[in-house]
């Protein structure tokens, strides 16, 4: 019968040829009376057999990632009679893996959005690298993820590639971060290959800033001839938030005379001071009112940032008009 062990050949051998093993008949007494032959895909081009000894050689550099298995057939013939000594036999040559492929991030570019002020541990995104090497061959395709850039705000789970927040971030200080993740095979051991990817993490706004008046005192004037409904001037607050989180409502906090009103221009986010009742210079030539400003939308969990509304004082001077 045929005698052989399982055949393995390492991929990417840089030698001209590589001895894989021996195929022989147990009837072969070593006197060169038998001839061994190799048949099948790869015979003669990738593998050869020493026809006298049955020794098999790879005569070409192999790439396991291209082809990991060769199925060949062997024959052994008695040179004197030309007859087969053994029935033709099929055998397998397996290409064994070396760590010749670096991890690759296939879903690049990565981009994620996370609310500012998110607590530690908040999941941002998962990055995944793949390695063409054999996952069943040692640690050639076992990956470990690490953070090359992004501390102290982000962390990555070494085995999953899950990126989490590790420190609260304020969009009003910095609104986006570039995080660089490295994937290393061989679970980081010597001889490891690595690949990197960049993740753009954008912070979305939350309403963590209340509007604040630009001025603590505004001076306006109104003619005593002005009809009710007249706009006598504008006041303005600023809000570091953006979008609907910066939408605000102005209102009167103090006006004993009940002469003025404030309406909000939602286009410009300005407060417009309106004359509610006609004024008379001879009766009262100046007024003092207090205005306040609040955000339009404040979720319950963010009320802590909005406890005291910003206020401003408005001094209004009445202008005299000659009366007949």
């Amino acid at each position: 019968g045929w005698v052989w062990n399982q055949f393995f050949v390492p991929e990417e051998m840089n030698t001209t040829s590589h001895h894989i093993g021996q195929l022989r008949s147990d009837l072969d007494n070593g006197n060169n009376s038998f001839q061994y032959k190799l048949l099948g895909a790869g015979a003669g081009s990738t593998f050869i057999i020493d026809e006298r000894t049955g020794d098999i050689y790879a005569i070409q550099k192999l790439d396991r990632e291209e082809r990991s298995l060769y199925i060949l057939r062997a024959q052994v013939i008695d040179i004197a009679t030309g007859r087969a000594v053994e029935p033709e036999s099929e055998f397998v040559i397996k290409v064994s893996d070396i760590n010749d492929n670096e991890p690759k991030f296939l879903d690049e570019p990565y981009e994620a959005i996370v609310p500012e002020m998110s607590p530690e541990g908040t999941l941002v995104i998962q990055v995944t690298a793949s390695d063409a090497d054999d996952p069943s061959s040692g640690n050639n395709a076992r990956l470990l993820y690490s953070l090359l850039q992004g501390q102290p705000y982000f962390s990555v789970e070494p085995t999953t590639g899950v990126i989490r927040i590790s420190s609260k971030m304020d969009r009003e200080l910095q609104d986006e971060y570039w995080v660089i993740i490295q994937a290393k095979d061989m679970i980081g051991q010597p001889g490891a290959l690595s690949g990197t990817t960049s993740v753009l993490i954008k912070l979305s706004d939350v309403n963590d800033n209340k509007p604040i008046f630009k001025e603590s005192l505004y001076r306006l004037t109104v003619s005593e001839s002005a009809p009710t409904g007249t706009s006598i001037g504008t006041i303005m607050a600023y809000d570091n938030d953006i979008g609907e989180n910066a939408e605000m409502d102005y209102s009167i906090e103090e006006d004993d005379s009940q002469t003025f009103d404030i309406i909000t221009n939602h286009e410009t986010q300005e407060g417009i001071v309106i004359l509610k009742k006609k004024v008379d210079f001879e009766h009262q030539n100046h007024y003092g009112i207090r205005a306040k400003v609040k955000n339009h939308h404040v979720p319950e969990q963010l009320m802590k940032y909005h406890t005291e509304a910003s206020t401003t004082f408005i001094k209004i001077q009445v202008e005299d008009v000659d009366e007949p």
Epitope: T15, T16, G44, I49, Q60
Partner: antibody, heavy 121, light 107 residues
Framework: EVQLLESGGGLVQPGGSLRLSCAAS????????MNWVRQAPGKGLEWVST????????YYADSVKGRFTISSDNSKSTLYLQMNSLRAEDTAVYHC??????????????WGQGTTVTVSS | EIVMTQSPVTLSLSLGERATLSCRAS??????LAWFQQKPGQAPRLLIY???TRATGIPARFSGSGSGTEFTLTISSLEPEDFAVYYC?????????FGGGTKVEIK
């Protein structure tokens, strides 16, 4: 008896081309690797190129890569070397040599007498 | 590439003497080394392959030894037809490379 007979050498100007042939007999040509080795006048041996049996794999010395092409015709049991963009330093006797068996597959166990290539203006 | 260095360049010996030729590889080539003999105007002839296996028809006075980076060709007793140039060659890595040769001449 294994025999190798080279032909096709001659005098050629720099930049010119030549095609060398090596007719083989006495063995199963397609089962063996074949080589070209050259020897400049008064110098040592220099490997040029190798082709595996059946022609699947070819290898070249850096000095000839991109200029020379090795090929074989199993039906004629003939090895070829197409030489283009020839230079003065390619002047040599060109030998073909048969590969061996097993672990000596990419070796050189039988040599031809050689054919002379002279590159000169 | 693997650099093969032969020494000495010339070896002057008398008939019947023992010749020892050395060949060193710049890195390990296992046992994938061959020795060739070349006489003026002739093609090289294979003497030894696999560092120590004599080719068909080669007399027993020729022997090879060594592995890795250091190799030796020994001619136990020089005959008149042995005076020639001897080359070592590695076939473990591409490109295949030859040593510069050792000329064995009559003293």
């Amino acid at each position: 008896e294994v025999q190798l007979l080279e032909s096709g050498g001659g005098l050629v100007q720099p930049g010119g081309s030549l095609r060398l042939s090596c007719a083989a007999s006495g063995f199963t040509f397609s089962s063996y690797a074949m080589n070209w080795v050259r020897q400049a006048p008064g110098k040592g041996l220099e490997w040029v190129s190798t082709i595996s049996g059946g022609g699947a794999n070819t290898y070249y010395a850096d000095s000839v890569k991109g200029r020379f092409t090795i090929s074989s015709d199993n039906s004629k049991s003939t090895l070829y070397l197409q030489m283009n963009s020839l230079r003065a330093e390619d002047t040599a006797v060109y030998h073909c040599a048969k590969g061996g068996m097993g672990g000596y597959y990419y070796g050189m166990d039988v040599w031809g007498q050689g054919t002379t290539v002279t590159v000169s203006s | 590439e693997i650099v093969m260095t032969q020494s000495p360049v010339t070896l002057s010996l008398s008939l019947g003497e023992r010749a020892t030729l050395s060949c060193r590889a710049s890195q390990s080539i296992s046992s994938n080394l061959a020795w060739f003999q070349q006489k003026p105007g002739q093609a090289p002839r294979l003497l030894i392959y696999g560092a120590f296996t004599r080719a068909t028809g080669i007399p027993a006075r020729f022997s090879g030894s060594g592995s890795g980076t250091e190799f030796t060709l020994t001619i136990s007793s020089l005959e008149p037809e042995d005076f020639a140039v001897y080359y070592c060659q590695q076939y473990n890595y591409w490109p295949l490379t030859f040593g510069g040769g050792t000329k064995v001449e009559i003293k």
